[in-house]
């Protein structure tokens, strides 16, 4: 009698391995014998495709090969005309051992910068992802961190984070390493050891010494009131990655020399100066009685910091003022280090207000120092823990140069505003105006010039000096 | 005991003028810069002053400049609020709040005067 | 000046529970010269004044349960209580005092259901 079809095993669920066979089974009970079609994802296999083989009257479904793409819901239909078609459906789940995908590169980093080491992994179930260096475990901390895609992320790289790395995904079926790549550090040039100011009588004999270091180690050049050194005689050492490069010269006048330290980062070049002051006692330019002149400004530290065309004081005490001072910007500026986002304009504006004081032409050009009062608002309010640590450090001897106490005013020793408002410069950055502000070149500092953040803008906050002050 | 003790506060006529006192006791006054910070009824923070710790130097914020004067006398471990010219807005829970040298974080809070601007 | 977001403005936890506040600030306060991010945590219970709980963003002020952590970095930072307290109950503000004025979020009150 005729039988309308009956499906006996319904299909179930088929776990396979990538380039294994997967079959699914699909028995029929029917009177006369069904036709027997087969969907993947309700598409229609074709009995021609030569990834898969169907036996005993279409039965039986044997995916040759699996791939990843072949997951999926696999149904078969049987029909033969008496009664409705029966369907029964069963999924393939393709498994997969670890696969590394995008393994990791040998990567160059500089200090202070984030690394990313890629790992990207295929494999189901999904591997967990784990990180070797050397031949220890890596450990996650604050700064370095696995991500949800396998690759190692590293803040701020510090040297010690240098060496060899492998990835490993790892999942129930299996485990994959990738290759050993290396992570090299790379440091910006620094000045360990700045050369010291000296005020000596004419024709000594002056040894400056500066060390400097860096990865790679840098190169020191000297540089006598901004041109390369003309005369002495330059000795260098190199150790454990430092450079320890000394000058001797025989001195007939005053200068400023800069020892200046460089080394390359790929196409870029890191740089970091410190400049020394050699005075002679007694000695003075005969031609120039008094002690400056008064010039718009030219340089280029100060250029956000101090007015457009501004008159400022060049002092003759130097052989060529202009480069002596705006060095001595740099140089005051590396001795301050990481200042708060707070701190750093207002210091800015003191250091580079103090250093080029506002000029009164005339007869005698004079310059006109900061109004105290701004400079306590920098001292106490502003900068208050960097100007402790800078006093501690000076009363310690830490300071190799006196050159920072020519940079950084004694507030007490300033005239106040209340005496005379036209005596001394006020600091208009103090007023916090945000559209004046820029960032610094990059100074001395070894790290690369960062963001100077906003500071609050005059419409929301200001600064004012207390009626109620009293002299100190 | 490190604590702030505010006084002072009470209900003014707009226009009107109000001094607020903030006694210090259990640490280095002269050596802390310190803030007043206001909370309106139901409403969140707002910063109002800063003062040095010589009292040298100060800084307002733009919503009480040139109507409010932040003092300090360091031999009485006391720090001031001069309100003058007060209007509706000004009114809220005054407090001194000793601010984290070098930081602009407050480590240190009184508990608060209230001061009521109503005709 | 840099405004601080907070949110949820309220929340109900019930005891034991983790409870999350976020911050969000206008503009990045994480300063690339120190990797410092300048935003501090406060709490605020009824009728008290506010109490320093966490600066530098993740750091405890001595005192504070360590059930009390705060992480984030940049614009995104979350004060999580782990484990919830009765005397948890308050108002939690965010400031920042990565620029002059430091200000403050509207606060999110945490209550217990």
């Known amino acids: 009698l005729p039988k309308a079809p009956v499906i006996t095993t319904p299909l179930e669920t088929v776990d396979a391995l990538v380039e294994e066979v997967a079959t699914f089974m699909c028995a029929v009970e029917s009177y006369p014998q069904p036709e027997i079609s087969w969907t993947r994802n309700k598409i229609l296999i074709k009995l021609f495709d030569t990834r898969y083989s169907i036996r005993e009257n279409g039965q039986l479904l044997t995916i040759l090969s699996v791939e990843d793409s072949d997951d999926g819901i696999y149904c078969c239909t049987a029909n033969n005309g008496v009664g409705g078609a029966v369907e029964s459906c069963g999924a393939l789940q393709v498994k997969m051992k670890p696969k590394i995908t995008r393994p990791p590169i040998n990567v160059k980093i500089i200090e202070g910068l984030k690394a990313v080491l890629p790992c990207t992994t295929m494999g189901n179930p999904k591997p967990s992802v784990s990180w070797i260096k050397g031949d220890s475990p890596l450990r996650e901390n604050s700064r370095i961190a696995v991500l949800e895609s396998g690759s190692l992320r590293i803040h701020n790289v510090q040297k010690e984070d240098a060496g060899q790395y492998r990835c490993v995904a790892k999942n129930s079926l299996g485990t994959a390493y990738s290759k050993v790549v290396k992570l090299e550090v790379e440091v910006f040039a620094r000045i360990l050891r700045a050369p010291e100011s000296h005020n000596v009588t004419f024709g000594s004999f002056v040894t400056l010494h500066c060390t400097a270091t860096g990865i790679p180690v840098p190169t020191i050049t000297w540089i006598e009131n901004g041109n390369a050194v003309s005369s002495g005689s330059i000795q260098e050492s190199v150790k454990d990655r430092v450079i320890d490069s000394r000058l001797q010269l025989f001195i007939t006048k005053p200068g400023l020399y800069t020892c200046i330290a460089t080394n390359k980062h790929g196409e870029k070049f890191s740089t970091a100066k410190a400049a020394a002051t050699i005075s002679i006692a007694e000695w003075s330019k005969p031609q120039k009685d008094n002690k400056g002149y008064c010039a718009q400004y030219r340089g280029e530290v100060c250029n956000a910091v101090l007015a457009k065309d501004a008159l400022v004081f060049l002092n003759t005490s130097y052989a060529d003022p202009e480069e002596a001072q705006e060095l001595l910007v740099h140089t005051a500026w590396n001795e301050l280090k990481v200042v708060s986002p707070v701190c750093r304009p207002a210091a800015e504006a003191l250091l580079c207000n103090h250093i080029f004081q506002e000029c009164s032409p005339g007869v005698v050009p004079t310059p006109i120092p900061i109004c105290r009062e701004y400079c306590l608002a920098v001292k106490e309010l502003f900068c208050a823990k960097e100007w402790l640590v800078m006093e501690e450090k000076t009363h310690r001897g830490l300071y190799r140069s006196e050159m920072h106490l020519l940079s950084v005013p004694e507030c007490s020793k300033l005239p106040s505003m209340h005496w005379d408002p036209t005596a001394c410069a006020r600091l208009p950055h103090l007023d916090y105006n945000k559209e004046n502000l820029k960032t610094f070149p990059p100074m001395t500092s070894s790290k690369p010039s960062v963001d100077i953040p906003n500071l609050p803008s005059s419409s929301s906050s200001s600064f004012s000096v207390s009626p109620t002050y009293s002299m100190t | 005991e490190v604590q702030l003790l505010e006084s002072g506060g009470g209900l003014v006529q707009p226009g009107g003028s109000l001094r607020l006192s903030c006694a210090a006791s259990?640490?280095?006054?002269?050596?802390?810069?310190m803030s007043w910070v206001r909370q309106a009824p139901g409403k969140g923070l707002e910063w109002v002053s800063v003062?040095?710790?010589?009292?040298?130097?100060?800084y307002y914020a733009d919503s009480v400049k040139g109507h409010f004067t932040i003092s300090r006398d360091n031999s009485k471990n006391t720090l001031y609020l001069q309100m003058n010219s007060l209007r509706a807005e000004d009114t809220a829970v005054y407090y001194c709040?000793?601010?984290?040298?070098?930081?602009?974080?407050?480590?240190?809070w009184g508990r608060g005067t209230l001061v009521t601007v109503s005709s | 000046d840099i405004v601080m977001t907070q949110s949820p403005d309220s929340l109900a936890v019930s005891l034991g529970e983790r409870a999350t506040i976020n911050c969000k600030s206008s503009q990045s306060v994480l300063y690339s010269s120190n990797n410092k991010n300048y935003l501090a945590w406060y709490q605020q219970r009824p009728g008290q004044p506010p109490k320093l709980l966490i600066y530098w963003a993740s750091t405890r002020e001595s005192g504070v349960p360590d059930r009390f952590s705060g992480s984030g970095s940049g614009t995104d930072f979350t004060l999580t209580i782990s484990s919830l307290q009765a005397e948890d109950v308050a108002i939690y503000y965010c400031?920042?005092?990565?620029?002059?004025?430091?200000?403050f979020g509207q606060g999110t009150k945490v209550e217990i259901k």
């Open positions: 709040a000793k601010k984290e040298l070098g930081d602009w974080y407050f480590d240190l």
């Open positions: 400031q920042q005092y990565y620029s002059i004025p430091p200000t």
């Open positions: 003062i040095s710790g010589s009292g040298g130097s100060t």
């Open positions: 259990g640490f280095t006054f002269n050596s802390s810069a």
